[in-house]
């Protein structure tokens, strides 16, 4: 839905979301651009990039919720998202130094994007949850009551280090969006059930 | 090869109603929605509804109060019934295939079309 | 509803030029839609979200935008590609499309 705007079809509402979570898990939207950008698109170093446990919820965990408490663990989760992107993204090189250096601007351009595209997101989860009548959901441009904090990336002064730890959080942020898409994709026809 | 053929009639007298079948082959209705559009040279491309793949359906709201979309799995058909049509109902009327089964108002195969003209 | 307004209505280019076609919302969508329609066939799907390219579609085809503002691109005009260009959105019910652009080769 437009930002801000609540569609009151559910199975438009529903699409939106799958179609959200279809684009976001695909790793060419930012992992992908980030590794280029950060000049980790080594095989030694991509090894590195490996998910940290824990980071986000698991498919197991976000199965085991009613759709109202899917949505908000799915919100809160987003809003460390979004903590952590602001994070990435102060700390990428600007468009004239890409060029200098011979990389894609337009791999910054995606990855400029993926706040906005979270937001997007971010929305339509609290639309549906209104969708589905429920009180306990905050608005998506709060901050949520009890939403955990954004994972803290180590402090450290190695650069190399904090973009690793970037990478990992992509790797992560992508799987779990697979994750949230499985889900969605299962939603049935009917806005009626509270449990799959 | 995914495919959507039509068949209806091309003349259709006022207030009565139209009735299109579109038989599709290359894939299967319960994966897959199937939406109705049609094309007037007045007013342009319109969305008028669907069918999903577990058979609830959506329309158009200043289309609602007169039509019906239905289907039969097991044929590979889907039934598109409008009534009390007037004049500017004549247009090509198009059956358009959802790109998966999500919920998907989108278009990724259409029809071959069913011109319709509303004349006495 | 959102409505679509797409310009210009009607354009023409020369082969191996450059063209451009807009697509504005009266409010923001997530993602534009956009279809090639030729005289006497029926529309086919060109571009989904925004910017990847529907199966089959040659790679001198390419969408942008955001917000209320999309566009559709050809980087070097083809014979074939003399048809009415549709866009499409879904953001917002019911689903809505433009009035259709035109492109005549000269």
């Known amino acids: 839905a437009a930002m801000g705007s609540c569609s009151k079809e559910y199975r438009m509402l529903l699409g939106q979301l799958q179609k959200q979570t279809d684009l976001m898990q695909d790793t060419s939207r930012l992992l992908d651009p980030y590794i280029r950008i950060q000049g980790l698109d080594i095989p030694k170093l991509r090894e590195h990039c490996r998910e940290s446990p824990g980071a986000f919820p698991s498919e197991e965990t976000l199965r085991g919720l009613g759709r109202r408490g899917f949505l908000q663990t799915l919100n809160a989760t987003l809003g460390c998202v979004l903590h952590r992107l602001a994070d990435l993204e102060q700390h990428l090189p600007k468009a004239q130094d890409l060029e200098r250096s011979g990389l894609n601007i337009e791999d910054l351009e995606k990855l400029q994007m993926a706040r906005p595209n979270v937001l997007g997101l971010r929305n339509n989860v609290y639309c549906m949850a209104q969708l589905l009548d429920n009180s306990d959901m905050t608005e998506p441009t709060k901050a949520g009551r009890g939403t955990p904090q954004p994972p803290t990336p180590t402090p450290t002064s190695d650069v190399f280090q904090r973009k690793l730890e970037g990478c990992s959080f992509l790797r992560g942020y992508h799987r779990f969006m697979h994750s949230v898409g499985r889900i969605f994709s299962k939603w049935g026809e009917s806005p009626n059930r509270s449990r799959r | 090869q995914v495919q959507l053929k039509q068949s209806g009639p091309g003349l259709v007298q006022p207030s009565q109603s139209l009735s299109i079948t579109c038989t599709v082959s290359g894939f299967s209705l319960t994966n897959y929605g199937v939406h109705w559009v049609r094309q007037s040279p007045g007013k342009g491309l319109e969305w008028l509804g669907v069918?999903?793949?577990?058979?609830?359906?959506d329309y158009n709201a200043a289309f609602m109060s007169r039509l019906s979309i239905t289907k039969d799995n097991s044929r590979s058909q889907v039934f598109f019934k409008m009534n009390s049509l007037q004049a500017d109902d004549t247009a090509i009327y198009y059956c358009?295939?959802?790109?998966?089964?999500?919920?998907?108002?989108?278009?990724?195969?259409w029809g071959t079309g069913t011109t319709v003209t509303v004349s006495s | 509803q959102i409505v679509l307004t797409q310009s210009p209505t009607i354009m023409s280019a020369s082969p191996g030029e450059k063209v451009t076609m807009t697509c504005s919302g009266s409010?923001?969508?997530?993602?534009m839609y956009w279809y090639q329609e030729k005289p006497g066939s029926s529309p086919r799907l060109l571009i989904e979200d925004t910017s990847n390219l529907a199966s089959g579609v040659p790679a001198r085809f390419s969408g942008s935008g955001s917000g209320t503002s999309y566009s559709l691109t050809i980087s070097r005009m083809e014979a074939e590609d003399a048809a009415t260009y549709y866009c499409?959105?879904?953001?917002?019910?019911?689903?809505?499309f433009g009035s259709g652009t035109k492109l005549e080769i000269k």
């Open positions: 409010s923001s969508v997530s993602y």
């Open positions: 358009a295939k959802s790109p998966n089964s999500n919920f998907y108002w989108y278009f990724d195969v």
């Open positions: 499409q959105q879904w953001s917002s019910y019911p689903p809505t």
């Open positions: 069918i999903w793949r577990g058979g609830s359906t």
